[in-house]
Amino acid sequence: QLPPGKPEIFKCRSPNKETFTCWWRPGTDGGLPTNYSLTYHREGETLMHECPDYITGGPNSCHFGKQYTSMWRTYIMMVNATNQMGSSFSDELYVDVTYIVQPDPPLELAVEVKQPEDRKPYLWIKWSPPTLIDLKTGWFTLLYEIRLKPEKAAEWEIHFAGQQTEFKILSLHPGQKYLVQVRCKPDHGYWSAWSPATFIQIPSDFTMND
């Protein structure tokens, strides 16, 4: 019996600068069925457009496919909540696709214990960038972070790998089973989720001595 409360656009993310999705939180429903619509215009334009795809991103979302995504324009968007008693509006959100990229986690994480005869043994970690990211165009610089810990330990040990897709770790506890994960982020944007954990058993004769 009341108009809807204020919705809030709380997150916009792009996996690769080619598409993006925004999500909103509904306000109170006022006790009545409420319809939501997202409208937007591009900076410098006055023509308002409605969300092209309410389905792909799940409930309370708007997905912008390739044909609706342009990298060099700021989107100004707002959610309208309407029930039989009235309409309410979110604050306007300004979105620049360049700054909302959150890639998928890196792929093909491989971990191996290397024990060269003439040098210290080490843990060799290798991975591939996420498939949706095209690094060849030069649009993207991906940075990587690795975390690992003994299976029963509480604390993670974190290593920054920069732009490389392989990394060596020297100091490990012999005889322990380690979990290893990797994640990535673009130069502007958000860290991906951590990749699924890969387990590696460190041999008992793995030595950290010179």
């Epitope: 019996q1 009341l2 409360g5 204020k6 109170t28 006790g31 039989q84 009235g86 309410s88 509006f89």
Partner: antibody, heavy 119, light 110 residues
Amino acid sequence: EVQLLESGGGLVQPGGSLRLSCAASGFTFSSYGMHWVRQAPGKGLEWVSAIGGRGVSTYYADSVKGRFTISRDNSKNTLYLQMNSLRAEDTAVYYCARGSNWTHALGFDPWGQGTLVTV
Amino acid sequence: QSVLTQPPSASGTPGQRVTISCSGSSSNIGSNTVNWYQQLPGTAPKLLIYGNSNRPSGVPDRFSGSKSGTSASLAISGLRSEDEADYYCAGWDGRLIGWVFGGGTKLTVL
């Protein structure tokens, strides 16, 4: 006949508290949103707060947010306004008004006779 | 400073037609319905028009309401002395998330 009767007004010191009540009769109380509207002496109307029929949804004017709490007891057909941290600018006649039902945006109708709060 | 803007006063002679305006914005009048209230001296307000142009039962058809864009108006035809009162427009504001009133218009029947 639909009736609303406010009570609980009076004189209170700044920083003090007061609880207003509004007894409703002549309609199915739980099917309507309810409102408090106030009018400072010689001034216009100012909406204060609203509550949905089930008491789940509540709204407040920015001027009272965090200080006033609206509630209702549908078993007693009564609307309440708990007013804390009262200020001189809260001095007004406080009206309770019936809002909309489940199907139509009806406006505030009827209004109670009002109760005077002096801070 | 009220969110909805009304002229502070209006006047007319008996039998005349008087119009009171109410100006708002896209988040109130522009996207929601307008209600009008009459407050006779020393009494509680009374609903005069709801949903832009609907009259509750008991309100004479001399009173009519309309809305266009972000403005609304109340027209009173065949003005009578008992119409002397304060008139308020009001409605839901979807940005402020609350109901807003105009400052009120004092109608004097000359």
